[in-house]
């Protein structure tokens, strides 16, 4: 069964700046990735970025830089200033879609005892939906 992993890291240099990394563990061609915060989109979540392998990337504040790391993983850097900046317990969700076969989603947040800049290797987050 395909899985999605989500890793959230607070930058050591800017304590209110976050890096979110997400990846898809499975076969199949990913056609769209959506990153949201505050929960899944439509269930209280807000879209931060949409990444398409051919048509490009769209992102919304406070997202600063979204990019593909590999064909099946992405990263997103969030600005840390202003009213819309994330806090330590913010939930981030990544949805990987392969149209029309299905989509896979997982959410994660900053580990409670994590030191800024210290990150564990990515481990699969609980799958919220694997359709």
């Amino acid at each position: 069964t395909p899985e999605v992993w989500v890793q959230v890291r607070m930058e050591a240099t800017e304590l209110s700046s976050f890096t979110i990394r997400c990846g898809f563990l499975g076969s199949g061609s990913i056609s769209l990735v959506t990153v949201s915060w505050g929960g899944p989109n439509g269930a209280g979540g807000t879209t931060l970025a949409v990444l398409h392998p051919e048509r490009g990337i769209r992102q919304w504040a406070p997202a600063r830089q979204a990019r593909w790391e590999t064909q099946s993983s992405i990263s997103l850097i969030l600005e840390g200033s202003g009213a819309s900046s994330p806090c330590a317990n913010t939930t981030f969700c990544c949805k990987f879609a392969s149209f029309p076969e299905g989509s896979w989603e997982a959410c994660g947040s900053l580990p409670p005892s994590s030191d800024p800049g210290l990150s564990a290797p990515p481990t699969p987050a609980p799958i919220l939906r694997a359709d």
Epitope: N41, R55, F99, P100, R129
Partner: antibody
């Protein structure tokens, strides 16, 4: 302006065949997944074929699998639906629709439809 | 395949009223869409991915929901909103539609 124009509908006997076409203009046709969706006399909407990845991957519901074939000619900006072994329950208006991936594959543009009647 | 059940099948409301229709899925869905269809016309996209308004759609339309329960709301009904509204999902193939909610104006 995005336009989708279907053609090829008509009256056909049960067991017969028909080929529908959808001429696309106003966008880069090869970049988009496309579907055929039909609307029955009872006004139900049913997706009958989807084509993605430049025509490599095609998808059909069980109701038409083995009888319908979707294809596309990106050079001609045209989508096709070859229908065979037609049944009375295939009577419907057939629409072609574009899927916009940045809209999460919503069908953001539809043609005007072409009517197919299967009757003896 | 996922079955979408729309309710009510038919509803009637007056201009200015707030109207809500629902779409219930037989299992959890990944992406939900809403379309409007007027007699003699093709369906028109209203809402994509549960709650996002398609281009040119008036802000009186809104969508919400998650999992198996979704809704479309028109905050202040206008005469031009008389139509049939369909929900549609894609989670895995096939893409499926609800049977529609026909909205008439009083």
């Amino acid at each position: 302006e995005v336009q989708l124009v279907e053609s090829g509908g008509g009256l056909v006997k049960p067991g017969g065949s028909l080929k529908l076409s959808c001429a696309a203009s106003g966008f880069t046709f090869s970049n988009f997944a496309m579907s055929w969706v039909r609307q029955t006399p009872a006004m139900r909407l049913e997706s009958v074929a989807t084509i993605v990845n430049g025509g490599i991957n095609t998808y059909y519901p069980d109701t038409v699998k083995g009888r319908f074939t979707v294809s596309r000619d990106n050079a001609k900006n045209t989508l096709y639906l070859q229908m065979s072994s037609l049944r009375s329950e295939d009577t419907a208006i057939y629409y072609c629709a574009r899927h916009d991936d940045f809209l999460y594959y919503a069908m953001d543009y539809w043609g005007q439809g072409t009517s197919v009647t299967v009757s003896s | 395949q996922i079955v979408l059940t729309q309710s009510p099948a038919i509803m009637s409301a007056s201009p200015g009223e707030k109207v809500t229709m629902t779409c219930s899925a037989s299992s959890s869905v990944s992406y939900m869409f809403w379309y409007q269809q007027k007699p003699g016309s093709s369906p028109r996209l209203l809402i994509y991915d549960t709650s996002n308004l398609a281009s040119g759609v008036p802000v009186r339309f809104s969508g919400s929901g998650s999992g198996t329960s979704y809704s479309l709301t028109i905050s202040r009904l206008e005469a031009e909103d008389a139509a049939t509204y369909y929900c549609q999902q894609w989670t895995s193939y096939p893409l499926t539609f609800g049977a529609g909610t026909k909205l008439d104006l009083k």
